[in-house]
Amino acid sequence: DAEFRHDSGYEVHHQKLVFFAEDVGSNKGAIIGLMVGGVVIA
């Protein structure tokens, strides 16, 4: 059987993002997201 490995040689960077809710609406507090490889996933 062939064995497959994911080893592209590239490091995938992730970054925490935090936005104020009132910047996009009337709610208070913060919205927390995560950007992985340039894509916001949460």
Partner: nanobody, 124 residues
Framework: EVQLVESGGGLVQAGGSLRLSCAAS????????MAWFRHAPGKEREFVAA????????YYVDSVKGRFTISRDNAKNTVYLQMNSLKPEDTAIYYC?????????????????WGQGTQVTVSS
């Protein structure tokens, strides 16, 4: 354009308190989210706290929660950082920064304007 000038830093013993101020010039102060960052020797610049344009929302890094309080007075174009129960690891240059609405408040690169910084030294 916004110009920021910090003050209030100094030398304090562990367990003590300091209040930093950041005075902003310009009539657009209330349109910016404001934050404090800090830069300790040999470390990257670190987000500390941010406050929304209205002052109604705040956000803190875990290491200062319950000890530091960020506030702002839009009538005086000033943002404050009340620092209590200071620890030696809080020693750093503290910078005030301004970012337009809609940007990530913890990300250094999203801030358009920075002050020159004020030194905070906490001795043990």
């Amino acid at each position: 354009e916004v110009q920021l000038v910090e003050s209030g830093g100094g030398l304090v013993q562990a367990g003590g308190s300091l209040r930093l101020s950041c005075a902003a010039s310009g009539r657009t102060f209330s349109t910016y989210n404001m934050a404090w960052f800090r830069h300790a020797p040999g470390k990257e610049r670190e987000f500390v706290a941010a406050i929304s344009r209205s002052g109604g929302s705040t956000y803190y890094v875990d290491s200062v929660k319950g000890r530091f309080t960020i506030s702002r007075d839009n009538a005086k174009n000033t943002v404050y950082l009340q620092m209590n129960s200071l620890k030696p690891e809080d020693t750093a240059i503290y910078y005030c920064a301004a970012a337009p609405r809609g940007r990530s408040i913890v990300t250094t690169a999203t801030y358009d304007y920075w002050g020159q910084g004020t030194q905070v030294t906490v001795s043990s």
